[in-house]
Interface confidence: medium
């Protein structure tokens, strides 16, 4: 019987609406035993991996991805995926990061994230392409 890996979750601290130049931290959570968390960006070739995984609770692990100074180019959709040997998980809901011009604290609470997706091992055509997990040898173009 194969283990059903729970979908990861994604959130942003301090929120999803960030003033230009401020910091934001994406938090990816999954079950205990995760080896690698990946934060994916709104481009199939843009992602960042970390093995710096901490235990958030007895049943949950997490990884944090910090952007120290948010730029307009950081706006967009993000989601998480994780590797718990020997499998990659499904992908988390979407989280949309909005970057605003004016300074000051975020004017929006964490929004409810949305969709989910699974990694494509062998993409079928470019219009529907999702990149393969890192174990497939695809080069990461880092997010920041």
């Amino acid at each position: 019987q194969e283990e059903d890996l729970p979908r990861p979750s994604i959130s942003a601290e301090p929120g999803t609406v960030i003033p230009l130049g401020s910091h934001v931290t994406f938090v990816c959570r999954g079950p205990v035993g995760v080896q690698t968390f990946r934060l994916e960006r709104d481009s199939r070739s843009t992602y960042n991996d970390t093995e710096d995984v901490s235990q958030a609770s007895p049943s949950e692990s997490e990884a944090r991805f910090r952007i120290d100074s948010v730029r307009e180019g950081n706006a967009g959709l993000y989601r998480c995926i994780y590797y718990k040997p020997p499998k990659w998980s499904e992908q988390s809901d979407y989280l949309e990061l909005l970057v605003k011009e004016s300074s000051g604290g975020p004017d929006s609470p964490d929004t409810e994230p949305g969709s989910s997706a699974g990694p494509t091992q062998r993409p079928s055509d470019n219009s529907h392409n999702e990149h393969a997990p890192a174990s497939q040898g695809l080069k990461a173009e880092h997010l920041y």
């Epitope: 979908r7 979407y94 409810e112 949305g114 969709s115 990694p119 062998r122 999702e130």
Partner: antibody, heavy 120, light 110 residues
Framework: SVKESGGDLVKPEGSLTLTCKAS?????????MCWVRQAPGKGLEWIAC????????TYYASWVNGRFTISKTPSTTVTLQMTSLTVADTATYFC??????????????WGPGTLVTISS | ELVLTQTPASVEAAVGGTVTINCQAS??????LAWYQQKPGQRPKLLIY???TLASGVSSRFKGSGSGTEYTLTISGVQCDDAATYYC????????????FGGGTEVEIK
Amino acid sequence: SVKESGGDLVKPEGSLTLTCKASGFSFSNSYYMCWVRQAPGKGLEWIACIYTGSTSGTYYASWVNGRFTISKTPSTTVTLQMTSLTVADTATYFCSRKLTNFNGAYLDLWGPGTLVTISS
Amino acid sequence: ELVLTQTPASVEAAVGGTVTINCQASQSISNLLAWYQQKPGQRPKLLIYRASTLASGVSSRFKGSGSGTEYTLTISGVQCDDAATYYCQQGYTSNNVDNAFGGGTEVEIK
């Protein structure tokens, strides 16, 4: 392509299993396969989806209430087991492939549908 | 709970004219919206995804637009073959399959 089978005339409170056979693509490509139904003269209603990758996540509409079960086999087949059927379950049942990427989640391949009629 | 409201429920169009169908989401769906065409007695067909990207083989007479919570499907140079019901579908909360589709818009050609 995808093709459904198993539609039939069933009495209320009866059970039925629908089968969806996929061809031309592999489940190892980690899609979702979904069932969507359409009652006569009505709109589209999503029932359930299953992830075809190495984990088998299943997702159901809240109204299903455990009456329907979606499952897959390694040989590119997805089934929908339906129990405690009522007249309101009369519909054409479509099998579809769902792509999920940064273009969103959308149904790019549909079967022709199979008709399920619940009547005494 | 994310809900899609599609308007109008039905519309009549003249050959060569233009049809506009609206789809409103109860929260922002980040352009992750698809449109489908379903002709009577047939399976649905994907027309547009990510709000404005035409699916393979779809005529450029179909145009999707919008952002945030408001989206529009425009059919220009309407042809008799366009008689169908059109559905929007949000692809933002993809594994919460409740209320994924709009209620549909029937397009009749006069």
